[in-house]
Interface confidence: medium
């Protein structure tokens, strides 16, 4: 509450997060022309990345393009990309949607379709839908521990969200345990009125707001965090503005002295921890 | 404008960026003692990194040290590093400029020069100039989509820079389209009065400032972002303070059961998105 | 000092860091059943990661699990994890502490102990203590250059912590050189009253606070930074809340067409650069 006689100061904050959980992923794997069901285990080193600061990312879905090599090949025949003759293909042209630079030739992509040849990582990435349901949909049961250290330098006051009296096997609940700083990812979504299973397919951004409203006067001292959750990406966003949350990264390797890469398009949830508030003192 | 009767509140912000573009890189490649011109394509997975939050990085230039192995070798003969006898080399000494730990021996680097032997990743990195012009100078034509979600918790007000009415094929222009949030990298530099081609060689830091001056009173409601651009690194910086922007990273691999690495010194532009402003309400 | 007649404005800040230093690491290496002492050199590409913004990380210790493959194996026999029959193992169960998904079988881990079989990256990570003393304890002598560009947009004022008159071979000292922005990591810890050698074992988070108290009136202009240091993680934290600072990451590779990984549990110091302050002008 506003105490007008107090000197207010904004919070200086540092955040540390730790995600826990294992996902079992079942997907079709093609090897030597034979497709079979493959099972694999993803642990924190597989689905999250060493990130600093006020964000952490949990991969919930992916599309892989394996064994790409730098060469010439037909580009992917997405809407409007097909050609019937070389006239349609412009040497040196880089279509922002494409994954390479056109050579000027129109070549067969498969038995029925022709596309412009490109210099690119080949075969070019197929523009297929993200798997549905999401491959790591069980990430809903992962938990994240959030440690938050705050400081009001002008008042020379420091505290943190985790107190010595807290129990490390708790799980945050708005009513039963609002001070616990271990959060189940599915609960964060539920609190924000969002469906984890749905968002996990295309990815998204979720805000975890930590609000410190601190009264630092000795006679009525109070300084504990309040947690709230809200979705930060626009779920109604137009296709052209890239809905959801994904990024591409590559694993490079050499095979028979040829540089190759596996391209991974990773969809997932980026959690942004937004710490704000003030410390007031007479 | 300052309305003194209003209660002002600082903005809470979350940013998501998406870079698009392909670069064709031509450089000399030496293999089996033969140097020839190599062409390669760089897409987002090659020139940018999965980063969180208010920064993104675009690699515009690089120097590679391939096939390094942990062993003993002469250090690079940079200015002041040459020796004529073992007396000049101090066992266990780590010169901050060097890349290894001295063994105490003075050994031939090439036919004309001797340097102190070091325990290091060998051969040690050659301290050569960044290629000029920059290898990925065409990054000037890349575009970045910036999504910004803001919140004034005290006023319980949330909005974003991208509105449903916006067109996903626009490009930001200060006069013609100041609300479009897709920016051509070259335009950002031009707006900031900087030369992309020049900065791309050594790298640099560019600030994209998003200013929200929000009047949240219903009778004169206004809350849209204003974009501006300024260079954040010091282009006149003394050599000793490391001008430009670069970092080193490594790709590790095994060859004949020996651990090796390729060291990449990546130069590029780090874009910092600085969101600020206030929301005022009676 | 507070000048009530001034219009105060919070600082907008951008930070760039550059770490320098080499560490020699000596550890036991087992190959072909023979254990011998291995020496290796770590440079910036080995112990730090390309990070953006207001944080940088220096690895000071690590535990490696080499050559893991996805298969079935007994889980690590940590406290409470042993079994005597299949009844104790629940098919499909994921113990948050475990590294895999139980198959329902109780199998021998070694001659004396049995544990539940899991589908996981095998062999599962041994839960051994971080090496003591820390493997990269010599990181105490590394230095970091911190470049800080600040802006008060309302006052249209920009400056930076590094001035043209500064000497690039200085080292920060609270008394002798309080404006030098090159910091020895060990000195940062000393200033904060912490023991680097101790913290390096489990890792931790160190805050570097940069306070700008700027008077922008022309007749009494002053705008220089003041540096201070404080530990941000809780050194007295209960085991269950994961004391120190570490994260796991993996290096993936293929051997005989089998996907493998080396898992690295990296302990280290995350340095958070916390920039705050105000610019006041009549």
């Amino acid at each position: 509450s506003d105490k007008l006689y107090q000197r207010k100061e904004p919070v200086i904050s540092s955040v540390h997060t730790k995600v826990k959980g294992i996902a079992e992923v079942t997907e079709n794997v093609t090897e030597g022309g034979v497709t079979k069901l493959g099972h694999s285990i993803f642990d924190t080193a597989d689905y999250t990345f060493p990130l600093q600061g006020n964000s952490f990312f949990v991969m919930t879905n992916y599309v892989k393009s394996e064994g790409q090599v730098q060469t010439l090949c037909p580009e992917y025949p997405r809407r409007g990309a097909q050609c019937s003759s070389d006239r349609r293909c412009k040497k040196g042209w880089m279509d922002p949607q494409s994954k390479g630079i056109q050579t000027g030739r129109c070549v067969p992509y498969d038995k029925t379709r022709k596309t412009c040849e490109v210099s690119a990582w080949c075969p070019t990435e197929e523009e297929k839908e993200a798997p549905r349901p999401a491959l790591l949909r069980s990430a809903e049961n992962f938990t994240v521990l959030i440690k938050n250290n705050i400081h009001f330098p002008g008042h020379n006051y420091t505290t943190r969200n985790i107190l010595p009296t807290m129990n490390g096997s708790c799980t945050f609940h708005k009513t039963w345990d609002p001070q616990c700083s271990i959060f189940r990812l599915g609960d964060i979504f539920q609190e924000a009125g969002e469906n984890f299973t749905e968002v996990a397919v295309q990815g998204g951004i979720m805000g975890i707001e930590i609000y410190w409203d601190c009264n630092l006067d000795s006679w009525s001292h109070h300084c504990r965090p309040r947690y709230s959750f809200r979705r930060l990406d626009d779920k109604n966003m137009d296709e052209s503005f890239v809905p959801g949350y994904n990024f591409r990264y590559a694993k490079y390797y050499k095979e028979n002295n040829v540089e190759k890469r596996t391209l991974i398009k990773a969809f997932g949830i980026r959690f942004d921890i937004l710490v704000f508030g003030t410390g007031g003192k007479f | 404008s300052d309305k003194l009767y209003q209660r002002k509140e600082p903005v809470i912000s979350s940013v998501h960026t998406k870079v698009k573009g392909i670069a064709e890189v031509t450089e000399n490649v030496t293999e089996g003692g033969v140097t020839k011109l190599g062409h390669s394509i760089f897409d987002t997975a090659d020139y940018t990194f999965p980063l969180q939050g208010n920064s993104f990085f675009v690699m515009t230039n690089y120097v590679k040290s391939e096939g390094q192995v942990q062993t003993l070798c002469p250090e690079y003969p940079r200015r002041g590093a040459q020796c004529s006898s073992d007396r000049r080399c101090k066992k266990g000494w780590m010169d901050p400029q060097s890349k290894g730990i001295q063994t105490g021996r003075c050994v031939p680097y090439d036919k004309t020069r001797k340097t102190c032997e070091v325990s290091a990743w060998c051969p040690t990195e050659e301290e050569k100039e960044a290629p000029r012009p920059a290898l990925l100078r065409s990054a000037e034509n890349f575009t970045v989509l910036i999504k910004n979600n803001i919140h004034f918790p005290g006023h319980n007000y949330t909005t974003r820079n991208i509105l449903p009415t916006m067109n996903g094929s626009c490009t930001f222009h200060k006069t013609w389209d100041p609300q479009c949030s897709i920016f051509r990298l070259g335009d950002i530099f031009q707006e900031a009065g900087e030369n992309f081609t020049e900065v791309a060689v050594q790298g640099g830091i560019m600030g994209i400032e998003i200013y929200w001056d929000c009047n949240l009173d219903s009778w004169s409601h206004h809350c849209r972002p204003r974009y501006s651009f300024r260079r954040l690194d010091d282009k006149n910086m003394d050599e000793s303070f490391v001008p430009g922007y670069n970092f080193r990273y490594a790709k590790y691999y095994k060859e004949n059961n020996v651990e090796k690495r390729t060291l990449i010194k990546a130069f590029g532009i780090r874009f910092d998105i600085l969101v600020f402003g206030t929301g005022g309400k009676f | 000092s507070d000048k009530l007649y001034q219009r105060k404005e919070p600082v907008i800040s951008s930070v760039h860091t550059k770490v320098k230093g080499i560490a020699e690491v000596t550890e036991n290496v087992t190959e072909g059943g023979v254990t011998k002492l291995g020496h290796s050199i770590f440079d910036t590409a080995d112990y730090t990661f390309p990070l953006q913004g207001n944080s940088f990380f220096v690895m000071t210790n690590y535990v490696k699990s080499e050559g893991q493959v996805q298969t079935l194996c007994p889980e690590y026999p940590r406290r409470g994890a042993q079994c005597s029959s299949d009844r104790r193992c629940k098919k499909g169960w994921m113990d948050p502490q475990s590294k895999g998904i139980q198959t329902g079988r109780c199998v021998p881990y070694d001659k004396t102990r049995k544990t539940c079989e899991v589908s996981a990256w095998c062999p599962t990570e041994e839960e051994k203590e971080a090496p003591r003393p820390a493997l990269l304890r010599s990181a105490e002598n590394f230095t970091v250059l911190i470049k800080n560009n600040i802006h008060f947009p309302g006052h249209n004022y920009t400056t930076r912590n590094i001035l043209p008159t500064m000497n690039g071979s200085c080292t920060f000292h609270k008394t002798w050189d309080p404006q030098c922005s090159i910091f020895r990591l060990g000195d940062i810890f000393q200033e904060a009253g912490e023991n680097f050698t101790e913290v390096a074992v489990q890792g931790g988070i160190m805050g570097i606070e940069i306070y700008w108290d700027c008077n922008l009136d022309s007749w009494s202009h002053h705008c220089r930074p003041r540096y201070s240091f404080r530990r941000l993680d809780d050194k007295n934290m209960d085991e269950s809340f994961v004391p120190g600072y570490n994260f796991r990451y993996a290096k993936y590779y293929k051997e005989n067409n089998v996907e493998k990984r080396t898992l690295i549990k990296a302990f280290g110091i995350r340095f958070d650069i916390l920039v705050f302050g105000t610019g006041g002008k009549f």
Epitope: - | - | G32, G67, Q68, V69, T71, V107, K111, N256
Partner: nanobody, 127 residues
Framework: EVQLMESGGGLVQAGGSLRLSCAAS????????MGWFRQAPGKLREFVAS????????RYIDSVEGRFTISRDNTKNTLYLQMNNLKAEDTAVYYC????????????????????YGQGTQVTVSS
């Protein structure tokens, strides 16, 4: 010093079976993974099958999967290889070896991870 003695080889017709044994002496090998390797004339020594120290996990080269079975009896310090439906390409000298490590799960097929002390036993499959 460990001694390994292979036995059970011989001449057999295609489609037939053999059971190889490997007796260890000198020290107990029950703490170690163990494996069978083979070497055909003019070829490199290749991995055939391996079993971890407890006998719970087994690994095979693709060409023998489903035809060969590796097993061990730790009370007798003995390793076995049951070979069914033999083919002409199985002709080779078969060696038994014990695994030195590290990491059996990952390196079970790598000859440099084993110590070979046996003389080998010849298996000839006639078509």
């Amino acid at each position: 010093e460990v001694q390994l003695m292979e036995s059970g080889g011989g001449l057999v017709q295609a489609g037939g079976s053999l059971r190889l044994s490997c007796a260890a002496s000198g020290r107990t090998v029950s703490d170690y993974g163990m494996g069978w390797f083979r070497q055909a004339p003019g070829k490199l020594r290749e991995f055939v099958a391996s079993i971890n120290w407890s006998g719970i996990y087994t690994r095979y080269i693709d060409s023998v999967e489903g035809r060969f079975t590796i097993s061990r009896d730790n009370t007798k310090n003995t390793l076995y290889l049951q070979m069914n439906n033999l083919k002409a390409e199985d002709t080779a000298v078969y060696y038994c070896a014990y695994f030195l490590g590290p990491n059996w799960y990952s390196n079970y097929g790598r000859p440099s991870s084993y110590d070979f002390y046996g003389q080998g036993t010849q298996v000839t499959v006639s078509s």
